[in-house]
């Protein structure tokens, strides 16, 4: 089966709450094209939020993600 | 710009074992890939993830019994299913993260019943 092309995602603004850390699936950076840099965590329940790349909490989630087992 | 196909589902008795793969092609380095489920009237869950790198997760129930791999230089990840349950009966859907964005598979369908 197949999926069908994405377009790149951006973040316009950022969420004003962290998210619990078992929340989170996976992540990725926006492109350098976008107007704003942003890290998109995709949630367990496969929804995409965006988050701001400079806060404490973003850049643990992100280590822990590369790091993990 | 990135396509997935998904093979390896099936009819599966209680206690039995599948393997799912899912192959990804395209022009764009993949950072992640993985796999999330969704058994009818549920939302989708996430199942388990793997990193370029080879990072790991896996949602709580399916730990010591699914185990994800991948063939980095095939673009490919597979999900070892082992001891499956009949609350694992669902249509999975691979995942592959890359170029900014997440891609997504139509899903294979596994069966778990006797």
């Known amino acids: 089966s197949l999926a069908a092309d994405t377009p790149t995602a951006c973040c316009f603004s950022y969420t004003s709450r962290q998210i619990p850390q078992n929340f989170i699936a996976d992540y990725f950076e926006t492109s350098s094209q976008c107007s704003k840099p942003g890290v998109i965590f995709l949630t367990k329940r496969s929804r995409q939020v965006c988050a701001d790349p400079s806060e404490e909490w973003v850049q643990k989630y992100v280590s822990d993600l590369e790091l993990s087992a | 710009e990135v396509q997935l196909v998904e093979s390896g589902g099936g009819l599966v008795q209680p206690g039995g074992s599948l393997r799912l793969s899912c192959a990804a092609s395209g022009s764009i380095f993949i950072n992640s890939m993985g796999w999330y489920r969704q058994a009818p009237g549920n939302e989708r869950e996430f199942v388990a993830r793997i990193s370029s790198g080879g990072s790991t997760n896996y949602e709580d129930s399916v730990k010591g019994r699914f185990t994800i791999s991948q063939d980095n230089a095939k673009n490919t990840v597979y999900l070892q299913m082992d001891s499956l349950k009949p609350e694992d009966t669902a249509s999975y859907v691979c995942?592959?993260?890359?170029?900014?964005?997440?891609?997504w598979g139509q899903g294979t369908q596994v069966t778990v019943s006797s």
């Open positions: 995942y592959a993260i890359g170029g900014g964005a997440v891609h």
